[in-house]
């Protein structure tokens, strides 16, 4: 014969536990029903009556099957440096995460307690570790042969363009400026006519003559005095 299915409330067999989504009520000494997420226990069970559940009120929630007398309060509204990535509902708490360009300097169980702006690397310095949701940017000086002319939390140092003839050599905060050695080819109307560099950047699609010898500039350039360690700006 199949075992009889017990309906809550029921007294458990000695040594056994209550089933899934049930809890043992110490007062009634019975296995009773839990309340579903979004509800709480309005009336606890007795030996003869099961738990009475009620919906959570506005701005309160329960995320799990439970038998709590009151729902939990949702967290406070997200601050101006945060975005609400999960709204407060009867079944889940509000989650605030840092808005783009910020990172979480102090986290809490879910979401973030304190956001801070991502560090910006000043000219001559590039991003050596991109920021994440929970970690700040790390800036490092641009290596010889590379530059960054921006104040940015995302820009890495980029190689100087290679010129047939250099007008102004590049440095850590400025790209090399090339001298135009041939007439600039025709461009679309209104286009700015700039000297054509022999670029190290592959997104420059024009065919470029290659210098007969192109050793790595990082091997050629002497290391100057080290720039100051603070390669970042707080703004």
């Amino acid at each position: 014969l199949p075992a009889q299915v017990a309906f809550t409330p029921y007294a458990p067999e000695p040594g056994s536990t209550c089933r899934l989504r049930e809890y043992y009520d110490q007062t009634a000494q019975m296995c009773c029903s839990k309340c579903s997420p979004g509800q709480h226990a309005k009336v606890f069970c007795t030996k003869t009556s099961d738990t009475v559940c009620d919906s959570c009120e506005d701005s309160t929630y329960t995320q799990l099957w439970n038998w709590v007398p009151e729902c939990l309060s949702c967290g406070s509204r997200c601050s101006s440096d945060q975005v609400e990535t999960q709204a407060c509902t009867r079944e889940q708490n509000r989650i605030c995460t840092c808005r783009p360009g910020w990172y979480c300097a102090l986290s809490k169980q879910e979401g973030c307690r304190l956001c801070a702006p991502l560090r910006k690397c000043r000219p001559g310095f590039g991003v050596a570790r991109p920021g994440t949701e929970t970690s700040d940017v790390v800036c490092k000086p641009c290596a010889p042969g590379t530059f960054s002319n921006t104040t940015s939390s995302t820009d890495i140092c980029r190689p100087h363009q290679i010129c047939n003839v250099v007008a102004i050599p590049g440095n850590a905060s400025m790209d090399a400026v090339c001298t135009s050695t041939s007439p600039t080819r025709s461009m679309a109307p209104g286009a700015v006519h700039l000297p054509q560099p022999v670029s190290t950047r592959s997104q420059h699609t024009q065919p470029t003559p290659e210098p007969s010898t192109a050793p790595s500039t990082s091997f050629l350039l002497p290391m100057g005095p080290s720039p100051p360690a603070e390669g970042s700006t707080g703004d």
Epitope: P130, S135, V138, K140, C142, M223, S226
Partner: antibody, heavy 118, light 109 residues
Framework: EVQLVQSGAEVKKPGATVKISCKVS????????IHWVQQAPGKGLEWIGR????????EYAEKFQGRVTITADTSTDTAYMELSSLRSEDTAVYYC???????????WGQGTTVTVSS | QAVVTQEPSLTVSPGGTVTLTCRSS?????????ANWVQQKPGQAFRGLIG???DRAPGVPARFSGSLLGGKAALTLSGAQPEDEAEYYC?????????FGGGTKLTVL
């Protein structure tokens, strides 16, 4: 002249720990991350981790997490990579490098061969 | 940890064009992976060729170019030279660590 000079070859027993050094010269060690990369015989490159000598912060590959410690001593311009609980598959050449993927400051040590054998 | 996959080997004729690719197990490769390409010639030091997906490192010949192609990082060699025969590794950045691909052995034949 930029140089990264690594310590000599090591032979270790399984379970032992090895510590390799990488002495840098020709640049300010605080200006660039120092990376460690593994190349097992006949295999490709495996990134182990990197240290920011300026503040000692480290990042490690998941595969080596818990077994590897990368440090840098700015007073001697030396970076170190310590790998513990060695096993036979750790037999490889280990390189220190300023290659960073972000900086184009591309220098490599000569490599240190570590042989793990009982 | 993510797995980065490359073609184990490719062959190109001298003067020909070949594209090496680099796939990520976590989804399409984006500029946030800062794709890098590193060259290893037998008995020589490693050499970074491409960084930031498509920037050639200083001194790298213009015949090497980097791009994103169909959700993968790509290294294109146009006008291959015998001296380009080498092992090529791609490396992708994942939030706080680099992962190298298995490498592509390029033969110029």
């Amino acid at each position: 002249e930029v140089q990264l000079v690594q310590s000599g070859a090591e032979v270790k027993k399984p379970g032992a720990t090895v510590k390799i050094s990488c002495k840098v010269s020709g640049f300010n060690i605080k200006d660039f991350y120092i990376h460690w990369v593994q190349q097992a015989p006949g295999k490709g490159l495996e990134w182990i981790g990197r240290v920011d000598p300026e503040d000692g912060n480290t990042e490690y590959a998941e595969k080596f997490q818990g077994r590897v410690t990368i440090t840098a001593d700015t007073s001697t311009d030396t970076a170190y990579m310590e790998l513990s609980s060695l096993r036979s598959e750790d037999t490889a050449v280990y390189y220190c490098s300023t290659w960073d993927g972000f900086s184009y400051f591309d220098y490599w040590g000569q490599g240190t061969t570590v042989t793990v054998s009982s | 940890q993510a797995v980065v996959t490359q073609e184990p080997s490719l062959t190109v004729s001298p003067g020909g064009t070949v594209t090496l690719t680099c796939r990520s197990s976590t989804g399409p490769v984006t500029t946030n992976n800062y794709a890098n390409w590193v060259q290893q010639k037998p008995g020589q030091a490693f050499r970074g060729l491409i960084g930031g997906t498509n920037d050639r490192a200083p001194g790298v010949p213009a015949r090497f170019s980097g791009s994103l192609l169909g959700g993968k990082a790509a290294l294109t060699l146009s006008g291959a030279q015998p001296e380009d025969e080498a092992e090529y590794y791609c490396a992708l950045w994942y939030r706080n660590h680099w992962v190298f691909g298995g490498g592509t052995k390029l033969t110029v034949l």
